[in-house]
């Protein structure tokens, strides 16, 4: 039975050209995390695997950095980065947990920062 829950940064905003940390946290389960996939819509951004470490998808290598932890740092943000991001936790024995984050990249110099895990 899947008892875990994923806490995410929720809806967040950031300035064009800046950086943002996407962060999810799995709690309330003793399941082991085999792998975390980060996806933007249906496109793979990155993988963090318990046995093999980090992989950043080639098309994002220049602007995506692993961490902190199982999170992901997006750099040199553009307006095109606005959209939904998903952290997909593949766990054993529970199965798959998915968290959603909505990022809005603003042209303005004043970006409202959302919930937790933000870069100040």
């Amino acid at each position: 039975m899947m008892t875990g829950t994923i806490e995410t940064t929720g809806n967040i905003s950031a300035e064009k050209g800046g950086s943002i940390i996407l962060q999810c946290h799995l709690s309330s389960t003793t399941a082991q995390v085999t792998q975390v996939n980060w996806e933007q819509q249906d496109q793979l951004l990155a993988i963090c695997n318990a046995d093999l470490g980090w992989h950043i998808s080639p098309s994002f290598k220049d602007r995506v950095a692993p961490g902190p932890g199982l999170g992901l740092t997006l750099q040199s943000l553009t307006v095109n980065d606005t959209g939904e991001y998903f952290c997909i936790y593949h766990t054993y024995p529970d199965g798959t947990y998915t968290g959603r984050i909505f990022l809005e990249v603003l042209e303005s110099s004043v970006a409202e920062h959302g919930a937790r895990f933000q870069i100040p």
Partner: antibody, heavy 120, light 110 residues
């Protein structure tokens, strides 16, 4: 359609070397962990080696450790297996295999295999 | 000797249900995923089951996988003559940091 095509097999003398190649098509090669698996005549399947996405992590079966080297060229969508100090017991069909996006799930696509015969 | 233990042979008649077992340990089957492969004579292995009980698209629902503790099993219901093949269980071994295969089970359809 996802495809793997092995080449480079042949007849080689004990102590000799051989380099196998596996050309991948139909998927984003960079995003997947790859393995080599072999099958001696009339025997079962035996895992040989695994390589992560960019080649910085590799694992080997004890039977080939120190003699075989797995590598990949993501720009050419190609997986390699360099086999040195070959022995009669290395005679087998060698298959390359693509793993699921979560590599621990197993291997979902296999090539047709290339035959290696070690004999004097 | 294989790290995972399978019976060397199994048999059944058309329409029957056949189960193939695979026994391992805490470092592979009990705490990891199991996949099953079918190898028809003279061909490359084909994936039947992954993630212990998931079937890839294109694999008939006559094939099912299950797992309990350090053992896994593959069940084939409504056995057909084309199911005659070798079947292998596989798991990632966390301690050995290697893929471990069962020795294979030769299924004969009588």
């Amino acid at each position: 359609e996802m495809q793997l095509l092995e080449s480079g097999g042949g007849l080689v003398q004990p102590g000799g070397s051989l380099r196998l190649s596996c050309a991948a098509s139909g998927f984003t090669f960079d995003d997947y962990v790859m393995s080599w698996v072999r099958q001696a005549p009339g025997k079962g399947l035996e895992w040989v080696s695994l390589i992560n996405w960019n080649g910085d992590k590799t694992y080997y079966a004890d039977s080939v450790k120190g003699r075989f080297t797995i590598s990949r060229d993501n720009s050419k969508n190609t997986l390699y297996l360099q086999m040195n100090s070959l022995r009669a017991e290395d005679t087998a069909i060698y298959y390359c295999a693509k793993h699921w996006i979560v590599f621990q799930y197993g291997m979902d696509v296999w090539g047709q295999g290339t035959t290696v015969t070690v004999s004097s | 000797q294989s790290v995972l233990t399978q019976p060397p042979s199994a048999s059944g008649t058309p329409g029957q249900r056949v189960t193939i077992s695979c026994s391992g340990s805490i470092s592979n089957i009990e705490t990891k995923y199991v996949s099953w492969y079918q190898q028809l004579p003279g061909t490359a292995p084909k994936l039947l089951i992954y993630n212990s009980d998931q079937r890839p698209s294109g694999v008939p629902d006559r094939f099912s996988g299950s797992k309990s503790g350090t053992s896994a099993s593959l069940a084939i219901s409504g056995l057909q003559s084309e199911d005659e093949a070798d079947y292998y269980c596989v798991s990632w071994d966390a301690s050995l940091k290697s893929w471990v295969f069962g020795g294979g089970t030769k299924l004969t359809v009588l």
